[in-house]
């Protein structure tokens, strides 16, 4: 794809997205704000105590499609949501847990007494 | 073809503000972010910062954050950097350029000149 | 900041020979994306810097064949294959890779 006045477009997006960064802010981020050629994500997961936490940050054009799809992970509670519309647009995403399914109680096998 | 048009100089005196405007023709003025870069003789070149014309988002440099503010006119496609509280330190050629992941095009520079 | 320095601050050569010019940077200029932010300039007196190489090693579209950039990490290169006389000017390395964006200070290409 050409861009203005350019021989090669030099990624799809023709300038450099920033994004807010909270627990994912690359060494090349400054206050909190990172760059990329592709999106800006929240996403929100359990840790290994099922306490909720939230990331924030750039996720670069490579691979993203797939990183932003947010394809369920099996005993995993996780949700993302990802942006492009203006810089900083992941302050604006909300994502929310799935909801704990039947079996995401049970840890193992079941013992009766 | 992309052009950045400055005025070639402007003259004001010691305390006194002024605004730099760069009108932008030859391309899609929201697509591209708008760089402000200063150049002193024998001082070379400084990155003032930058504003993204599509939601006026600005990133300065620090230097720079208490002399420059920059903002956009998306409706003619101009850029302007206002500078306050001038002293002969800032007397330089300021440049526009546009910015993708890089500085493609340049301005030809406006030259300020602070004095009494 | 990363500081660009550059080497060396004037290159005197001979019309048809090869130029080299040296850039270093403080930190390294890979970005979280994988791209490597950095870009070499030309400033003829009295005009504005007009690019010559971006993301180290990319000819802007009209540049001649005979500039080439390598490098990678820190340390980069421009090279020109047989200088010609509008070859002559100010050359400037730029990093976009880290906030502020820095510049080398800059090496004069003159006639020997």
């Known amino acids: 794809k050409k861009e203005d006045g350019e021989s090669t477009a030099p990624t799809a997006r023709p300038k450099v997205l920033r994004c807010k960064c909270h627990h994912h802010c690359p060494e090349d981020s400054v206050n909190n704000i990172c760059s990329t050629d592709g999106y800006c994500f929240t996403m929100i997961e359990e840790d290994d105590s099922g306490t909720p936490v939230v990331t924030s940050g750039c996720l670069g054009l490579e691979g993203s499609d797939f990183q932003c799809r947010d394809t369920p992970i099996p005993h995993q509670r996780r949700s993302i949501e990802c942006c492009t519309e203006r810089n900083e647009c992941n302050k604006d995403l909300h994502p929310t847990l799935p909801p704990l399914k039947d079996r995401d109680f049970v840890d193992g096998p079941i013992h009766h007494k | 073809q992309v052009q950045l048009q400055q005025p070639g100089a402007e003259l004001v005196k010691p305390g006194a503000s002024v605004k730099l405007s760069c009108k932008a023709s030859g391309y899609t003025f929201t697509n591209y972010w708008m760089q402000w870069v200063k150049q002193r003789p024998g001082q070379g070149l400084e990155w003032i910062g930058e504003?993204?014309?599509?939601?006026?988002?600005?990133l300065y440099n620090q230097k720079f954050k208490d002399k420059a503010t920059l903002t956009v006119d998306t409706s003619s496609s101009t850029a302007y950097m206002q500078l306050s509280s001038l002293t002969s330190e800032d007397s330089a050629v300021y440049y526009c350029?546009?910015?993708?992941?890089?500085?493609?095009?340049w301005g030809q520079g406006t030259t300020l000149t602070v004095s009494s | 900041d990363a500081v660009m320095t550059q080497s060396p601050l004037s290159l005197p050569v001979s019309l048809g020979d090869q130029a080299s010019i040296s850039c270093r940077s403080s930190?390294?200029?890979?970005?979280?994306?994988?791209?490597?932010?950095l870009h070499w300039y030309l400033q003829k007196p009295g005009q504005s810097p007009k690019l010559l190489i971006y993301?180290?090693?990319n000819r802007f579209s009209g540049v001649p064949d005979r500039f080439s950039g390598s490098g990678s990490g820190t340390d980069f290169t421009l090279k020109i294959s047989r200088v010609e006389a509008e070859d002559l000017g100010v050359y400037f390395c730029?990093?976009?890779?880290?906030?502020?964006?820095?510049f080398g200070s800059g090496t004069k290409l003159e006639i020997k």
């Open positions: 993301k180290v090693s």
């Open positions: 504003i993204d014309p599509s939601d006026r988002y600005t």
């Open positions: 350029a546009r910015f993708g992941y890089y500085v493609d095009y």
């Open positions: 930190q390294s200029l890979v970005h979280s994306t994988g791209n490597t932010y």
């Open positions: 730029s990093q976009t890779t880290h906030v502020p964006f820095t």
